[in-house]
């Protein structure tokens, strides 16, 4: 439905508070280096303009598109060329090319300082002094570091952030109350950002059809009692929401997400029996709750899939009449029966089924040709099952830190050209699959593990895309979205890699390591491990373990020494020499 003024329409739908927050997020995700104060000024100007349009939709410029209004505003930033270089060229373009240009310049790994958490009293004072600015700053700092963060969900995080400070800044022990809440928000935020990044990559790199297939599979698992027509409607609406958010249309996205939550709750009888509690919550909590809701129980007496998709005489007729609808039905029927499968596995099965029908429906005897198609699924199902079993056994044997180290070695040998910080970050996250998923019973392990690995490997893909260094990574990332994990799993040691020159500086440590948190200390050690493998890719597990054990003992010893810096200097030299000898460097 057309509105005379799009900006007035969205302002009225969302309300001033959400409107301002979403515009701030949008601007911070586009201009990631701009100071906070500059963004706040731009947002205030846009908000004042929106109010004039609410008062009179026929006022000057009120009929302009949001992209035109926001793009014009961003292009007024004085330091655009100095700060962003070629991104300033976007401003010479017309819409919609200008917005596409801004999108292409979003940086998944912006050169921004790490967020350091101030003392609790300092944070509480800042919160009490100016709550509005404090919360805006949170939105700004998260949005600029995570340019694809799902904007309506970031509003939910900000609401929880505010609640944490409101409660804890008046608690007897502020730190004990606040810090665990902030840690939880940080970890959940990183996970949420990575999940959304995969959705955007799916849409932008593989297209709407790929995203819709993912959504059909996931929603069919979650809402197995819903009819195919209902699932199809939800998929269409959800695709619109994510297309908008990934495209920078945050006001439309938030508005449409609210409409979708409303529709789901009004029709929960024909969607899922698990929605009742979610639907009693306020909007932001409701939308979050629906997105995380547990799978409903499967309907009674579902017939064998073979009846419709193998034994029926009409398989090729049904396929020819509407290929994507028939494949959608196959995916829906398979997924609702298999909450125990990962979404990516279900998509591989659907792709195999599609390939078989393409071949067989052109054959002399189609039924004879596709009669055994379900037999082809067996190895596809067993491969992730076996991989998860082996890796969970390894995780239970080693614990998280050493399991991460095993993955660091494995992935550095596969793709040694990738930067050390990226290998450390990605392998640490891959290693978290153990504590996240191995505790689950068999029926929940695969959807937990393989779909999580898809999210983590997408981080590798988007970071690598910024500065491509490995043809193998590019190949695994671009050939097939659903086969990324099997592609990386299948990679062996890269025999073409020329080992990195040894640099003693890389293995020189100082007393500052002693004051680091356990996590930071682990990262230092894991960085050294990656560098070791890059110098000596043929080193055995035993050799690497011996060197890492010596390294851990060296850090422990020097951190206990009276003169720590001297210890690190002298013992460090000895350790480097011993390690070189042990590895034959």
């Amino acid at each position: 439905d057309a509105h005379k003024s799009e900006v007035a329409h969205r302002f009225k739908d969302l309300g001033e508070e959400n409107f301002k927050a979403l515009v701030l997020i949008a601007f911070a995700q586009y201009l990631q280096q701009c100071p906070f104060e500059d963004h706040v000024k731009l947002v205030n100007e846009v908000t004042e303009f929106a109010k004039t349009c609410v008062a009179d939709e026929s006022a000057e410029n009120c009929d302009k598109s949001l992209h035109t209004l926001f793009g014009d505003k961003l292009c007024t930033v004085a330091t655009l060329r100095e700060t962003y270089g070629e991104m300033a060229d976007c401003c010479a373009k017309q819409e919609p090319e200008r917005n596409e240009c801004f999108l292409q310049h979003k940086d998944d790994n912006p050169n921004l300082p790490r967020l350091v958490r101030p003392e609790v009293d300092v944070m509480c004072t800042a919160f009490h002094d100016n709550e509005e600015t404090f919360l805006k700053k949170y939105l700004y700092e998260i949005a600029r570091r995570h340019p694809y963060f799902y904007a309506p969900e970031l509003l939910f995080f900000a609401k929880r952030y505010k609640a944490a400070f409101t409660e804890c800044c008046q608690a007897a022990d502020k730190a004990a109350c606040l810090l665990p809440k902030l840690d939880e928000l940080r970890d959940e935020g990183k996970a949420s950002s990575a999940k959304q990044r995969l959705k955007c990559a799916s849409l932008q790199k593989f297209g709407e059809r790929a995203f819709k297939a993912w959504a059909v599979a996931r929603l069919s698992q979650r809402f197995p009692k819903a009819e195919f027509a209902e699932v199809s409607k939800l998929v269409t609406d959800l695709t619109k929401v994510h297309t908008e958010c990934c495209h920078g249309d945050l006001l439309e996205c938030a508005d449409d997400r609210a409409d979708l939550a409303k529709y789901i709750c009004e029709n929960q009888d024909s969607i899922s029996s698990k929605l009742k509690e979610c639907c009693e919550k306020p909007l932001l909590e409701k939308s979050h709750c629906i997105a995380e809701v547990e799978n409903d129980e499967m309907p009674a007496d579902l017939p064998s899939l073979a009846a419709d998709f193998v034994e029926s005489k009409d398989v090729c007729k049904n396929y020819a009449e509407a290929k994507d609808v028939f494949l959608g039905m196959f995916l829906y029927e398979y997924a609702r029966r298999h909450p125990d499968y990962s979404v990516v596995l279900l998509l591989r099965l659907a792709k195999t089924y599609e390939t078989t029908l393409e071949k067989c429906c052109a054959a002399a005897d189609p039924h004879e040709c596709y009669a055994k198609v379900f037999d082809e699924f067996k190895p596809l199902v067993e491969e992730p099952q076996n991989l998860i079993k082996q890796n969970c056994e390894l995780f239970e044997q080693l614990g998280e830190y050493k399991f991460q180290n095993a993955l660091l070695v494995r992935y550095t040998k596969k793709v040694p050209q990738v930067s050390t910080p990226t290998l450390v970050e990605v392998s640490r996250n891959l290693g978290k699959v153990g504590s996240k998923c191995c505790k689950h019973p068999e029926a929940k392990r695969m959807p937990c593990a393989e779909d999580y690995l898809s999210v983590v490997l997408n981080q590798l893909c988007v970071l690598h895309e910024k500065t491509p260094v490995s043809d193998r990574v590019t190949k695994c990332c671009t050939e097939s979205l659903v086969n990324r994990r099997p592609c990386f799993s299948a990679l062996e040691v890269d025999e073409t890699y020329v080992p990195k020159e040894f640099n003693a500086e890389t293995f020189t440590f100082h007393a500052d390591i002693c004051t680091l948190s356990e996590k930071e200390r682990q990262i230092k050690k894991q960085t050294a491990l990656v560098e070791l493998v890059k110098h000596k890719p043929k080193a055995t597990k035993e050799q690497l373990k011996a060197v890492m054990d010596d390294f851990a003992a060296f850090v422990e010893k020097c951190c206990k020494a009276d003169d720590k810096e001297t210890c690190f200097a002298e013992e460090g030299k000895k350790l480097v020499a011993a390690s070189q000898a042990a590895l034959g460097l």
Partner: nanobody, 118 residues
């Protein structure tokens, strides 16, 4: 607006046969599993059978298994129920409804009455 128009009922002797039809309109017929339910005089609704979207997969209540056969023609937006070896306890108003094995009450059409009596 969703419309389901049942027909084909009538008076039949025990052991006899009938074929019920249901013509659907106002929605994308082939995107829904469909079911037949019935209501005997003075009783509640009882599920009879269901059929998948494509039409190959079916499920039947124990009381009608082996006697009733459900089918659909998506090109004609029509659902069928073939009733064989009818018994007096099959006497009921028969309704077609959207959905597989519906466990939530759904709007019912006018139905078609099957009476089995000698």
């Amino acid at each position: 607006e969703v419309q389901l128009q049942e027909s084909g009922g009538g008076l039949v002797e025990p052991g006899g046969s009938l074929r019920l039809s249901c013509v659907a309109s106002g929605f994308t017929f082939q995107h829904y599993a469909m079911s037949w339910v019935r209501q005997a005089p003075g009783k509640g609704l009882e599920w009879v059978s269901s059929i998948s979207t494509v039409g190959g997969g079916t499920s039947y209540a124990d009381s009608v298994k082996g006697r009733f056969t459900m089918s659909r023609d998506n090109a004609k937006n029509t659902l069928y129920l073939q009733l064989n070896s009818l018994k007096s306890e099959d006497t009921a108003m028969y309704y077609c409804v959207r959905g597989w094995h519906p466990d939530v009450p759904r709007p019912l059409g006018q139905g078609t009455l099957v009476t089995v009596s000698s």
